[in-house]
């Protein structure tokens, strides 16, 4: 009897639309009113423990009181009806939770897919959040038959996989219903033949076979998915070299119908390629399969496509009638070697005389030659054959080189050291660029590269360091031998000097002093020394700064005060900043030489 509530609130389980209004009514039971000696005037409404002011209540009759809420902005509100009993004690009568949310929106973008070997799955856009439990049901039918409803699971409310097997070549109608406590809506209906929604399994067993006859082709074979018996397939075939990250694609028109092999052409010899393939219905209606597993193959070797860069150096200390010549060449990059390099063949022909042949595995050959003119040729060999020959004329000992390049310049750009020149009027076969780091501590170890005779601007292809002085030499090579070399110094990137100059006095007079210093060693310059600044001062005086041209190694300070201690230091500047040298002190004499007090 005591557990029986004193009254009730109507409605008991309200679900209302967000931002709508809501009225609740509390009705007291007669027995309760008699027991507590109360009526509707004694009702107190509370929400979330806050008491609503009495002016907002409407007394309907002696047993009922109502309260109205405008613009419910919360998803749930606890509402209780209470009565004031003896001694103003509050007794709870009943409580409800006002749940609020939104009605479902019409589902949009309904689409279906038939993954090969699986049942049809449809998905849709369910619209805005309703804040309420909203059920989505996928409905489907043939013209003559209704299929079982597909109820979306709570954790995946915007997709559903049907329970029946797919039948191709019969149109099906599909739509979605969304329903919650505030309403029910239906999507637009879509009508289609499931054959146009197929996503095939990817082709499998992809394999790659090379050809001994043609080094530019690879043949692909694969097994098609079973769906090929239902639909005609088309393919995307993509390939890339093993180290590349971007894929190239075979023109789609070449793979527009069902097949199980394809020959890829125009590939580079002796190169590993990775392939992948996918397929779909040939008319483009449906979905592409996932990509197959990748498969790789290596094209067959071809003879080297280019002769190596070829140059020579003559040992300056030659014995009577002979000279030591070192022939040097560069390894071909893989895209020109076209296979595994086996060896190099060098021939040396003395002018109008006999031929000497050498087979070499290294990239240099040292020979003793007479002072005559020689013709050297170099070929590189792999399993398939030989490259064209690189030809080099080694002129006679008394040869006078002429026709250098003109206007030689070197400059850094985009983290590379560029070299440019004006081409001589004579026909140049090729250019040889040599460079080395100038250092007081180590000899200049030369690196080199060859450029075509048409080139007049290039960058040094080596591992260059910043703050190092590079001596760059450009030699044009003509049919009868090398032209005169031209050289220039350059930096990849300058920095301030590591040390400043050490200044000293050469001669000190009563009113002047001749200062001198040594040029900074190249290892500490870190750039081109553009100018010096001499700073000098007395203990009590202001500092004076004098700029001096970088070609000077001495400077005279004049208008000095006699019998005075001077402090002097010197800074050297590159394009990137300066560095001070150590401070040096000297004292001017009281009297000039021969002068008496």
């Amino acid at each position: 009897e005591l557990l029986d509530p004193c009254g009730y609130i109507s409605p008991e389980s309200p679900v209302v639309q967000l931002h709508s209004n809501f009225t609740a009514v509390c009705v007291l039971k007669e027995k309760c009113m008699d027991y507590f000696h109360v009526n509707a005037n004694y009702i107190v409404w509370k929400t979330n423990h806050f008491t609503i002011p009495k002016e907002q209540y409407t007394i309907i009759n002696r047993t009922a009181s109502s309260v109205t809420f405008t613009d419910i902005a919360s998803l749930n509100i606890q509402l209780t009806c209470n009565i004031l009993t003896f001694g103003q004690l509050e007794q709870n009568v009943y409580g409800i939770t006002i749940i609020s949310g939104l009605p479902p929106e019409k589902p949009k973008n309904l689409s279906c897919i038939v993954n090969e070997g699986k049942k049809m799955r449809c998905e849709w856009d369910g619209g805005r959040e309703t804040h309420l439990e909203t059920n989505f049901t996928l409905k489907s039918e043939w013209a003559t038959h209704k299929f079982a409803d597909c109820k979306a699971k709570r954790d995946t409310p915007t997709s559903c996989t049907v329970d029946y097997s797919t039948v191709y070549f019969v149109n099906i109608e599909v739509w979605v219903e969304a329903e919650n406590a505030l309403g029910k809506v239906t999507s637009d209906h879509i009508n289609f033949d499931p054959v146009y929604k197929v996503k095939p399994n990817p082709p499998h067993n992809l394999s790659v076979i090379n050809s001994e006859e043609l080094s530019s082709i690879l043949k692909l074979t694969w097994t098609n998915p079973s769906i090929k018996s239902v639909i005609i397939l088309k393919y995307n075939i993509q390939y890339r070299t093993k180290d590349a990250s971007t894929w190239s694609q075979i023109p789609p028109e070449d793979t527009a119908s069902t097949r199980s092999s394809f020959t890829v052409q125009d590939l580079k010899p002796f190169t590993e390629y990775v392939f992948r393939i996918r397929c779909m219905k040939e008319d483009g209606k449906g979905y592409w399969s996932d990509w197959s597993e990748e498969a790789s193959g290596i094209t067959y070797e071809d003879r080297p496509s280019k002769a190596p860069s070829f140059w020579y150096k003559i040992d300056p200390s030659h014995t009577q009638g002979y000279r030591t010549v070192q022939l040097v060449w560069k390894t071909l990059p893989p895209f020109e070697a076209n296979g595994k390099i086996l060896d190099y063949e060098v021939t040396l022909t003395r002018w109008k005389s006999h031929l000497q042949n050498y087979t070499v595995n290294a990239t240099k050959l040292t020979v003793n030659l007479t002072n005559d003119r020689y013709l050297a040729t170099l070929t590189v060999r792999n399993l398939v054959g030989k490259s064209d020959a690189a030809v080099l004329t080694i002129p006679a000992c008394d040869f006078q080189a002429t026709h250098p390049v003109m206007d030689l310049k070197a400059f850094p750009k985009d983290n590379m050291l560029w070299v440019e020149w004006t081409t001589p009027r004579e026909s140049v076969k090729k250019y040889i660029l040599e460079w080395c780091v100038l250092s007081d501590k180590a000899p200049c170890i030369t690196d080199w590269q060859q450029e075509d005779g048409t080139v007049h601007r290039t960058y040094l292809r080596g591992n260059l360091a910043e703050s190092k002085c590079y001596l760059i030499t450009v030699t044009p090579v003509y049919a009868d031998g090398p032209g005169s070399p031209e050289s220039i110094k350059a930096y990849l990137k300058q920095a301030p000097p590591s040390k400043g100059p050490t200044v000293r006095t050469k001669k000190v007079g009563k009113n002047e002093a001749v200062l001198e210093w040594d040029q900074l060693p190249v290892d500490v310059q870190n750039g081109f020394i553009r100018n010096y600044t001499i700073f000098y001062r007395t203990i009590i005086g202001n500092e004076t700064a004098v700029n001096v041209d970088s070609s000077h190694t001495e400077y005279t300070l004049s208008s000095l005060t006699s019998d005075t201690l001077y402090m002097v230091r010197m800074a050297a500047y590159t394009d990137e900043g300066g560095k001070d040298g150590p401070e040096f002190t000297f004292t001017t004499p009281k009297f000039a030489q021969g002068e008496i007090e």
């Epitope: 931002h19 929400t47 609503i52 907002q56 809420f69 405008t70 613009d71 902005a73 919360s74």
Partner: nanobody, 124 residues
Framework: QVQLQESGGGLVQPGGSLRLSCTAS????????MGWFRQAPGKGREAVSC????????FYADSVKGRFTISRDNAKNTLYLQMNSLKPEDTATYYC?????????????????WGQGTQVTVSS
Amino acid sequence: QVQLQESGGGLVQPGGSLRLSCTASGLTFDDSVMGWFRQAPGKGREAVSCISSSGANAFYADSVKGRFTISRDNAKNTLYLQMNSLKPEDTATYYCKRGHACAGYYPIPYDDYWGQGTQVTVSS
């Protein structure tokens, strides 16, 4: 977290006007019911006015009806209370509050946290 900052209070003579502002952050302002409460020295806190989220509906306690106007600018996340014909009994600290809903002029408070408020003193 939700922050409500009241401003615009001050000392004003009887019959004068003030405009209180409340700047909100950390909430979806244009989805929130808002209102004003006040607390006079030595008295309990009482509701003054409530306004719907769109600003279309506004409600007032009888004691301020015809003198006070509640409004909001959803673009600026700001609530206002225009107070005209002020009386000495309007002297109080005024608080702005987010509400679950309007029960007439009473904005059902979202929580038990009350900010600094802004002091209004009506005196000659």
